[in-house]
């Protein structure tokens, strides 16, 4: 893709249900620019159905999140830093989720616990990006009757069968100055060969993930293009009449401050229902994770602890995390108390975000670390390594990655 810029704004909204948008496992994050701030299409797919503990498969339901891309041996490295020496503890910043499918669907990446999967309250990092290949279906993607993945649905109007996701983070992709939305984890971007997802939680860690429900999205699929069309009022007069009829005074929005402050950058462009289809997932396989440090994040199942390994993931020199000020991101585990910061991620065409399957945030399982916090992401140090600081953004990205991998069973 031609270096689409993605702005990631993590929106922690614990309150409503979000319509989940499709998330491309690889490369493309579906970015939905919801005209309604309320609508949060999370990329993460919440499993429409939570698999039963007995392992029985519920049709189309994948309940695990997959999250990172293993490097040779990292591939084998457990979430917990159990890999053999030299292995990158399975934490590869990129988990390539099959383009278009979630790791969960593919069965790759972290394995979310039912609890995680069932959690409707999830922090979702949504990267809305354009995917090359909008194909790819997720069992768990929220789809309309037509089978198309719905992108943004207003809160409270989550697509049927989908669990509402509360903390949805959406990341708008190159879209007009619309409010940024934090990326939500859902299906990993599909385009790619590598999407920048990291799967934070591992199967063994039921709450280790940032409580992001695993979405059963297909593996590394390239995102589908979804257009959210909101039809503008047919005529100004009609709009007026409608407004006039409403005796309710219009709220003084001037004094209203968006939760995320995203409205600050909003520019209203007349044209009423212009809908932009931002669903094109970014081919993260070419995305360079500019967060260089993501490579060092290892997801350890069980705990929310993130261990930063000194080993640098081999992103093939193509992945550079551009998340820049992750250092400023602070995730407060355990509650909706999160600090959301907006960061622009520039995915370069040649950058390979290993988040597809490669970026794995390793969390220590409670057993291992005893840390029960959902996830501790460290800040990225100047060296590019993540210094154990909470980073909601990383978490959401990781969640996205994990979700797509999960679909694939990776």
């Amino acid at each position: 893709m031609a270096e689409p810029r993605q702005e990631f704004e993590v929106m922690e909204d614990h309150a409503g249900t979000y319509g989940l948008g499709d998330r491309k496992d690889q490369g493309g994050y579906t970015m939905h620019q919801d005209q309604e701030g309320d609508t949060d299409a999370g990329l993460k797919e919440s499993p429409l159905q939570t698999p039963t503990e007995d392992g029985s498969e519920e049709p189309g339901s994948e309940t695990s999140d997959a999250k990172s891309t293993p490097t040779a041996e990292d591939v084998t490295a457990p979430l917990v830093d159990e890999g053999a020496p030299g292995k990158q503890a399975a934490a590869q910043p990129h988990t390539e989720i099959p383009e278009g499918t979630t790791a969960e669907e593919a069965g790759i990446g972290d394995t979310p616990s039912l609890e995680d999967e069932a959690a409707g309250h999830v922090t979702q990092a949504r990267m809305v990006s354009k995917s090359k290949d909008g194909t790819g279906s997720d069992d768990k993607k929220a789809k309309g009757a037509d089978g198309k993945t719905k992108i943004a649905t207003p809160r409270g109007a989550a697509p049927p069968g989908q669990k509402g996701q509360a903390n949805a983070t959406r990341i708008p992709a190159k879209t007009p100055p619309a409010p940024k939305t934090p990326p939500s984890s859902g299906e990993p971007p599909k385009s790619g060969d590598r999407s920048g997802y990291s799967s934070p939680g591992s199967p063994g860690t039921p709450g280790s993930r940032s409580r992001t429900p695993s979405l059963p999205t297909p593996p590394t699929r390239e995102p589908k293009k979804v257009a959210v069309v909101r039809t503008p009022p047919k005529s100004p007069s009609s709009a007026k009449s409608r407004l006039q009829t409403a005796p309710v005074p219009m709220p003084d929005l001037k004094n209203v401050k968006s939760k995320i402050g995203s409205t600050e950058n909003l520019k209203h462009q007349p044209g009423g229902g212009k809908v932009q289809i931002v669903y094109k997932p970014v081919d993260l396989s070419k995305v360079t994770s500019k967060c260089g440090s993501l490579g060092n994040i290892h997801h350890k199942p069980g705990g929310g602890q993130v261990e930063v390994k000194s080993e640098k993931l081999d992103f093939k020199d193509r992945v550079q995390s551009k998340i820049g000020s992750l250092d400023n991101i602070t995730h407060v585990p355990g509650g909706g108390n999160k600090k959301i910061e907006t960061h622009k991620l520039t995915f370069r065409e040649n950058a390979k975000a290993k988040t597809d399957h490669g970026a794995e945030i390793v969390y220590k399982s409670p057993v291992v670390s005893g840390d029960t916090s959902p996830r501790h992401l460290s800040n990225v140090s100047s060296t590019g390594s993540i210094d154990m600081v909470d980073s909601p953004q990383l978490a959401t990205l990781a969640d996205e990655v994990s979700a797509s991998l999960a679909k694939q069973g990776l």
Epitope: P51, P70, L79, I108, T111, S214, S365, G409
Partner: antibody
């Protein structure tokens, strides 16, 4: 050292069921998906499905829906794949393979269990 | 039949470069990452390439994968006798909603 050790060869009759186990060691069992892939004699690989070792959630290939059941016992870090209503064409080597966490693929495989279905 | 298409065989002499093709469609390779496996006679498959072009540690850099559109070739440069094996490509298929493999390519050195 990651290791996936599968149970021994089995000979079954048509209509019977077979349950293959995959004992895992060397990594956090619940942190990865376990996939099952089979390979008929002289044939290629065929994916059967996966189980989320952590939650027990499963996903099966359409071809095996209704006949395969994947389970796991986290206490003994073992995954199981049971295939019922066996037919002669189910004769194959059944592999358990770990879903890569950091990439797209199956990073570790069991040695395989040969299941022979004889009339 | 296999969803992903691979040539049944390929051969080369030591030192040569051999490329194995793996072609599919928009619902699989076109939209998902590809992985490659090497299966030596009588053994279980081994991950060779994951996420299109990533090599697990321990895999010689002679093996390289790539993906373009709906095709994902595996190249083996500097062919060696120990490379004689069966190679399988795999990816997720959105339509089938499952993993799919190629029929395998037997490489003879």
């Amino acid at each position: 050292q990651v290791n996936l050790r599968e149970s021994g060869a089995e000979v079954k009759k048509p209509g019977a069921s077979v349950k293959v186990s995959c004992k895992v060691s060397g990594y956090t069992f619940t942190g990865y998906y376990m996939h099952w892939v089979r390979q008929a004699p002289g044939q290629g690989l065929e994916w059967m499905g996966w189980i989320n070792s952590n939650s027990g959630a499963t996903k099966y290939a359409q071809k095996f829906q209704g006949r395969v059941t994947m389970t796991r016992d986290t206490s003994i870090t073992t995954a199981y794949m049971e295939l019922s209503s066996l037919r002669s064409d189910d004769t194959a080597v059944y592999y358990c393979a770990r879903g890569a966490r950091d990439g797209y693929g199956f990073d570790y495989w069991g040695q395989g269990t040969l299941v022979t279905v004889l009339a | 039949s296999y969803v992903l298409t691979q040539p049944p065989s390929a051969s080369g002499t030591p030192g040569q470069r051999v490329t194995i093709s793996c072609s599919g469609g928009s619902s699989n390779i076109g939209s998902n990452a590809v992985s490659w496996y090497q299966q030596l006679p009588g053994t279980a498959p081994k991950l060779l390439i994951f996420t299109n072009d990533q090599r697990p540690s321990g895999v010689p850099d002679r093996f390289s994968g790539s993906k373009s559109g709906t095709s994902a070739p595996l190249a083996i440069s500097g062919l060696q006798s120990e490379d004689e094996s069966d190679y399988y490509c795999a990816t997720w298929d959105d339509s089938l909603n499952g993993w799919v493999f190629g029929g395998g390519t037997k490489v003879t050195v």
